[in-house]
Each structure stands twice: as structure tokens, then as C-alpha cells.
């Protein structure tokens, strides 16, 4: 089957500091040296790009400086962390993997990770 399977967890709960981490794993049909990983957020029928990084196999993922994502790679596995999340960012986060080089190109799209974000309760004022 000329297709690439991408696996990611179904559900992740963000920390109280608005940080969510999950693993995106892909079964590569070819020996890629250059891989692009994109995180998409789907809310209703709207899809937006959260972040993207292209990396050479064996090297680290490098997101743009202003990206809310960080990540590390190990073989066919990418560990993704999204920070700065708030309750309104709760949604389905989809991992998209593309084997860019060498040919042939392959596309793999995960089923998505539902990330739940709960805003922390504000600390009550304390009188001393």
C-alpha cells in the first residue's frame, strides 16, 4: 500500500500552565532524509496551521522563533509540545507528516489529538 500511516494519541490534557505534549509517530514507506511536520487545528470545519517544521533525519526539529511549538525527533517519532494554550484553544490537533526528500513524496495525516485546556482558577486575594 503506497501510503504513510501516522499515529497520535486520541486525547491529551494540557497542564495548568497551558502546555500540552504528544507523540506523532509515522510508518515510513520510504527512506526519507528530509521530513516536514505540521500541526493543524481543526475547529468545526475551520482548519488552521498551528506550527510547522522541516528537519533532516538525525537532526533536531527547528520551529520558527515565534512558534508556540517545540519538538524533538527520534527515528520515525516526533515529540511535540505546544505551549501558551488557553481554554479557548481546546480542539482537535492533527499531525501531518510529509516525506519531502528523496522522491517519492509521501503524505501522512493523523486522526488528531483532542487537547483539552482548562484555564487555572485565579488565586484568591489573601489578607495577611
Amino acid at each position: 500500500c503506497k501510503a504513510m500511516h501516522v499515529a497520535q494519541p486520541a486525547v491529551v490534557l494540557a497542564s495548568s500552565r497551558g502546555i500540552a505534549s504528544f507523540v506523532c509517530e509515522y510508518a515510513s514507506p520510504g527512506k526519507a532524509t528530509e521530513v516536514r511536520v505540521t500541526v493543524l487545528r481543526q475547529a468545526d470545519s475551520q482548519v488552521t496551521e498551528v506550527c510547522a517544521a522541516t528537519y533532516m533525519m538525525g537532526n533536531e526539529l527547528t520551529f520558527l522563533d515565534d512558534s508556540i511549538c517545540t519538538g524533538t525527533s527520534s527515528g520515525n517519532q516526533v515529540n511535540l509540545t505546544i505551549q501558551g494554550l488557553r481554554a479557548m484553544d481546546t480542539g482537535l490537533y492533527i499531525c501531518k507528516v510529509e516525506l519531502m526528500y528523496p522522491p517519492p513524496y509521501y503524505l501522512g495525516i493523523g486522526n488528531g489529538t483532542q487537547i483539552y485546556v482548562i484555564d487555572p482558577e485565579p488565586c484568591p486575594d489573601s489578607d495577611f
Epitope: K2, T38, K96, L107
Partner: antibody, heavy 118, light 108 residues
Framework: QVQLVESGGGVVQPGRSLRLSCAAS????????MHWVRQAPGKGLEWVAV????????YYADSVKGRFTISRDISKSTLYLQMNSLRVEDTAIYYC???????????WGQGTMVTVSS | EIVLTQSPGTLSLSPGERATLSCRAS???????LAWYQQKPGQAPRLLIY???SRATGIPDRFSGSGSGTDFTLTISRLEPEDFAVYYC?????????FGQGTKVEIK
């Protein structure tokens, strides 16, 4: 709104060159793969070429490899197709199309006609 | 290269009828990477279905896609006058990107 507009088509003799342009607007050009697809008169759709995000990785159909060059100017949000050594069988409407977030071609230009004839 | 074969070549139907279009792949295609397009004379193709069964933005629900492996189907539940056109399937999971030869849905 999201839009692709092709230009540069025309009538050209076999062996000559032509450069097509596709001006994109309404979306972040660098976030999408951009394709050229052609359609010979009365025929079906044939994928021609693609250039990715940074413009470094490019793929071509065997029928145009070595003759056509795809490129993009991110600062101008414009896609190009340089067509050299044109053949009669290259006669077609050429469409540029955006590879959407999920990979399918979700936005298409109106097409530009290229006729290769002596 | 994945070859896509569409059938029938032409489908002659009346408005209000159900249209069933078939797309068969030469090798297994993940349903995540199969699309259907509509093309009317003198117009560019328009994306109808992606991921074998997800409707693109603004596509009416009379259009539906199904299938997996090597066999995929586009169904138009009740043909409207504006649905008479040529329909193409496409795989986009690996290069080269390939299209079927098309099915023409014409008025009977």
C-alpha cells in the same frame, strides 16, 4: 478572498519557450504546496509539477521532466512554470492549484491556454 | 505510479435521479488521500470530496463519497440541473499525483 490567477499563455512554435505565472492572494503563500495541472483539449486532468513551502523541493511528471521548471517567489506570492523545448503534445489549459492542508487541491486558478503549433 | 480507472465513462441520467460513480485504483490507496472534483465546460475543476468522504467547504450534502483500499464511490443522491458535469477522482498520498480519466454525467 482566496484566489489564484494565471497568465502567460499563448501560441508558440515547437521547440520554443514560454513562462506561465500564477498570482496568489488571500492566503499565506509559503504555507502551501503549489501545483501545476494541465488539460489537453477534450482530455482529462494531468498533474505537471509541484513546489513546496520554501521552494527548494520540486517534483515533476515524467512527461515534462528536464524541460519544465517550477518556481515560486514568496515575496510576490507568485508561482511560475518555465516551459522550454515545447512540443505539440504540451498544448493544453494550464491550471495552478493549491495543495490544501489535507493535501487535496482545494483552490484552482481559471487556467491559461498554451498552444504549441508550427 | 497509481493508476485510477473511472467507470462508467458516461452516465446518462435525469434530474432527480441518483448517480453512482466509481473509481478503482491499481494499488491500495489510503482513504485519507482520495479526492473527487467536478468540472463544468469552460471552468476550472472544483474540489468536492477529500479524504474519500469529507465534503469540501460549501459542497451540498447530496454529494457523498465512500470506499477504501482500491474501490471508491462518489454518489449524488438527487441530481440537480447544475450537477451535470465531468467528475474526476484523484490520489494525493504519494507522488506522482494522479487523476482518473473522468466520468461525464449528462442529461438523459
Amino acid at each position: 478572498q482566496v484566489q489564484l490567477v494565471e497568465s502567460g499563455g499563448g501560441v508558440v512554435q515547437p521547440g520554443r519557450s514560454l513562462r506561465l505565472s500564477c498570482a496568489a492572494s488571500g492566503f499565506t503563500f509559503s504555507s502551501f504546496g503549489m501545483h501545476w495541472v494541465r488539460q489537453a483539449p477534450g482530455k482529462g486532468l494531468e498533474w505537471v509539477a509541484v513546489t513546496w513551502y520554501n521552494g527548494r523541493n520540486k517534483y515533476y511528471a515524467d512527461s515534462v521532466k528536464g524541460r519544465f521548471t517550477i518556481s515560486r517567489d514568496i515575496s510576490k506570492s507568485t508561482l511560475y512554470l518555465q516551459m522550454n523545448s515545447l512540443r505539440v503534445e504540451d498544448t493544453a489549459i494550464y491550471y495552478c492549484a493549491r495543495g490544501g492542508y489535507y493535501g487535496a487541491f482545494d483552490i484552482w486558478g481559471q487556467g491559461t491556454m498554451v498552444t504549441v503549433s508550427s | 505510479e497509481i493508476v485510477l480507472t473511472q467507470s462508467p465513462g458516461t452516465l446518462s441520467l435525469s434530474p432527480g435521479e441518483r448517480a453512482t460513480l466509481s473509481c478503482r485504483a491499481s494499488q491500495s490507496v489510503s482513504s485519507s488521500y482520495l479526492a473527487w472534483y467536478q468540472q463544468k465546460p469552460g471552468q476550472a475543476p472544483r474540489l468536492l470530496i477529500y479524504g474519500a468522504s469529507s465534503r469540501a467547504t460549501g459542497i451540498p450534502d447530496r454529494f457523498s463519497g465512500s470506499g477504501s483500499g482500491t474501490d471508491f464511490t462518489l454518489t449524488i443522491s438527487r441530481l440537480e440541473p447544475e450537477d451535470f458535469a465531468v467528475y474526476y477522482c484523484q490520489q494525493y498520498g504519494s507522488s506522482p499525483w494522479t487523476f482518473g480519466q473522468g466520468t461525464k454525467v449528462e442529461i438523459k
